[in-house]
Interface confidence: medium
């Protein structure tokens, strides 16, 4: 079946200085700014644009080694980066993949608000666990707050 | 059964003040941004105010800074404070969840309290 | 802000007909497009989320398309408890703003 998740979650920092951070330069900012929850992420095919596989890596100790994701869509113009988990992870025998969108839309404040809708094919009649959603979304939150967090203390950075 | 139910309102006058509560059951009120809405006499829908799971909370300018969304999480309970009232903020004024399956539609409202502000 | 406009303001139709509301968004988004039914006295009620996707317990008569600044909410077979006021509604950005409604009458 395909079980939706949506979350929305508001940021101080302005849309596209956001998308710029967080998602065109995720793949470098994440581990530098998050180590305890990603330490690397490679390109294994494409050069970034949809199509794209990357590997993440997690450090030792977390309930994952890795996750392979594709690269489904990127528009700059809207703030918008699709991609699917396809391998590791939570994927396996219960789960076939998971379809990410995030949105990062202005917010009337000057900051903007990440709209990140979740789509989980699973395998057979098999139904997804509402605790692992939570936890993933926790995981995506404090990914954003750490991004938020560098880009305060470093004014410069990706304007 | 998941329900919302909204109380508060009344008669009051202008430059009164008021606090409507919606007492949610069957979901937690801080797993889900939550927002008032309110339908003035013979009007259409008007969004108010939101109140994101986070806490983050955001205001249509019609209201910002005479209303405050809160939410009390062991009472399970979300509030609006409404000061400097006016006339013009006579309504129904509902409480509705946003959806986390949905894509941030509205799929619980609660029944609606009235609220009246005249001299 | 995100302005919608509905259309027609008011209709009159007969059991059976199909009916079609159109609401069209002043900027152009994806995804975050309700609509609501209303009957007088009482809250609004979802019939259609994310643009097409049918809320759980809503007759199958009821579906909804569109994207960009353009979407419809369609009935297939009007059925005499289908009057009301029905309202589009965006999700996608604050402040939500929802169409001024349809009031559909049965003939």
């Known amino acids: 079946g395909v079980f939706n998740y949506e979350a929305e979650t508001p940021s101080v920092i302005p849309a596209a200085r956001l998308f710029k951070a967080f998602i065109l330069d995720g793949d470098k900012l994440l581990p530098k700014v998050a180590p305890e929850a990603v330490s690397s992420v490679e390109n294994i095919e494409g050069n970034g644009g949809p199509g794209t596989i990357k590997k993440i890596t997690f450090p030792e100790g977390s309930p994952f080694k890795y996750v392979k994701e594709r690269v489904d869509e990127v528009d700059r113009v809207n703030f918008k980066y699709s991609f699917s988990v396809i391998e590791g992870g939570a994927v396996g025998d219960a789960l076939e993949k998971v379809c990410n969108e995030i949105k990062i839309v202005a917010a009337p404040d000057g900051g903007s608000i990440l709209k990140i809708s979740n789509k989980f094919h699973t395998k057979g009649d098999h139904e997804i666990n509402a605790e692992q959603i939570k936890i993933e979304k926790e995981k995506a939150v404090g990914l954003l707050k750490a991004v938020e967090s560098y880009l305060l203390a470093h004014s410069d950075a990706y304007n | 059964e998941v329900q919302l139910v909204e109380s508060g309102g009344g008669l009051v006058q202008p430059g009164g003040s008021l606090r409507l509560s919606c007492a949610a059951s069957g979901f937690t009120v801080s797993s889900n941004s939550m927002s008032w809405v309110r339908q003035a006499p013979g009007e259409g829908l008007e969004w108010v105010s939101v109140i994101f799971s986070g806490g983050i909370t955001y205001y249509s300018d019609s209201v910002k800074g005479r209303f405050t969304i809160s939410r009390h999480n062991s009472k399970n309970t979300l509030y609006l404070q409404m000061n400097s009232l006016r006339t013009e903020d006579t309504a129904v004024y509902y409480c509705?969840?946003?959806?986390?399956?949905?894509?941030?539609?509205?799929?619980?409202w609660g029944q609606g309290t009235m609220v009246t502000v005249s001299s | 802000d995100i302005q919608m406009t509905q259309s027609p303001s008011s209709l009159s139709a007969s059991v059976g007909d199909r009916v079609t509301i159109t609401c069209r968004a002043s900027q152009s988004f994806d995804t975050y497009l309700n609509w609501y039914q209303q009957k007088p006295g009482k809250a609004p009620n979802l019939l259609i989320y994310a643009t097409s996707s049918l809320q759980s317990g809503v007759p199958s008569r009821f579906s909804g398309s569109g994207s960009g600044t353009d979407f419809t909410l369609t009935i297939s077979s009007l059925q005499p408890e289908d009057f009301g006021t029905y309202y589009c509604q965006q999700s996608y950005s604050i402040p939500y703003t929802f169409g001024q409604g349809t009031k559909l009458e049965i003939k």
């Open positions: 509705a969840r946003h959806s986390n399956w949905n894509f941030d539609a509205f799929d619980i």
